[in-house]
């Protein structure tokens, strides 16, 4: 059976485009399997993974992919160009940065060719699911005999984040953390000499240009205090 | 896994009212396009109604339409269908789905318009 996706253009007797198909409407059979889910994540704002679990699937079964964006001038209905496999069986896709609209709504659809029923439509909001690379670059500058600032750079736009710094002593069994607004940097105003510091840092999209719940991943961490260098007392760049 | 209930028919005289709701779990509702699909007696699948993620889109069958509203609350992942003005023809079990033409072996809830 060939299917037709149609494309929305907002109206109201045309908003069933994001549900519609062309697909036998007689069959007394009208229990399926649901599709797995589709997750979303945008890399940094370079490019973006749609995944499903394709392991879910009863039978291995090479599910299809279309996407568009709701109400706005990229409302065609594009294909995955780029699919991502497991097992050689479709598990997601890739689209890449010039096919990326934050600040539009995101409407994915995924659909078992084989049996074209199985048809779900999802929107998300893609300003809620950026995931910032890894902070770069930590710096730590002794501004006085008890003060430290950690410094750090992000591969993005910096007032778009902000960022949680955990730090502990080798004496320590946990991590102290702070959080961070887009300012990326932070001062510890008391620092015990005889100890030995380690600082990292993540990064989140978040409040300013999306409401995104998920961290980077962790930095390099970064250590201070004793058995640093003493060249320089008063810049430390040393990463584990 | 995925799971959605489907509750509030019963047995109305044609001209009454009766409001469906779907509790769902196992999934991001949320983000999630959801019908309301129907089975008469010995007929096949018809949809009816149709909600987009944040509730701002919704599009009808044109025998429901200006009877028939659906919505959602996705703060307690649940769809609804109210339904005004009954006719005998109305009468099937009600479906919700995140399929258009098919469901995910819920139960349905059976609707009755007879006088």
């Known amino acids: 059976l060939n299917t037709t996706i149609l494309t929305p253009n907002g109206n109201e007797d045309t908003t069933a485009d994001f549900f519609l198909t062309t697909m036998p409407t007689d069959s007394l059979s009208v229990s399926t399997l649901p599709l797995p889910e589709v997750q979303c994540f945008v890399f940094n704002v370079e490019y973006m993974n749609c995944t499903w679990n394709s392991s879910s699937e009863p039978q291995p079964t090479n599910l299809t992919l279309h996407y568009w964006y709701k109400n706005s001038d990229n409302d065609k209905v594009q294909k995955c160009s780029h699919y991502l496999f497991s097992e050689e069986i479709t598990s997601g896709c890739q689209l890449q940065k010039k096919e990326i609209h934050l600040y539009q709504t995101f409407v994915v659809q995924l659909q078992d060719p084989r049996e074209p029923r199985r048809q779900a439509t999802q929107m998300l909001k893609l300003q809620n699911l950026v995931i910032p690379w890894a902070p770069e670059n930590l710096t730590l500058h002794k501004l006085s005999e008890s003060q430290l600032e950690l410094n750090w750079n992000n591969r993005f736009l910096n007032h778009c984040l902000e960022h949680l710094v955990q730090y502990r002593t080798d004496w320590d069994h946990s991590w102290t953390e702070q959080s961070v607004d887009y300012r990326h940097k932070f001062s510890l105003p008391s620092v015990d000499g005889q100890k030995r510091y380690t600082f990292r840092v993540r990064s989140r999209f978040n409040p300013l240009c999306g409401s995104a719940q998920h961290w980077s991943e962790w930095s390099h961490p970064i250590h201070w205090g004793s058995n640093t260098s003493k060249e320089n007392p008063f810049l430390f760049a040393l990463e584990a | 896994q995925v799971q959605l209930q489907e509750s509030g028919g019963g047995l109305v005289q044609p001209g009454g009212s009766l409001r469906l709701s779907c509790a769902a779990s196992g999934f991001t509702f949320s983000t999630y396009v959801m019908n309301w699909v129907r089975q008469a007696p010995g007929k096949g699948l018809e949809w009816v109604s149709g909600?987009?993620?944040?509730?701002?889109?919704?599009t009808y069958t044109d025998s429901v339409k200006g009877r028939f509203t659906i919505s959602r609350d996705n703060a307690k992942n649940t769809l609804y269908l109210q339904m005004n003005s009954l006719k005998p023809e109305d009468t099937a079990v009600y479906y919700c789905?995140?399929?258009?033409?098919?469901?995910?072996g819920s139960q349905g809830t059976q609707v009755t318009v007879s006088s």
């Open positions: 789905s995140m399929f258009r033409m098919a469901t995910t």
């Open positions: 909600i987009d993620s944040d509730g701002d889109s919704t």
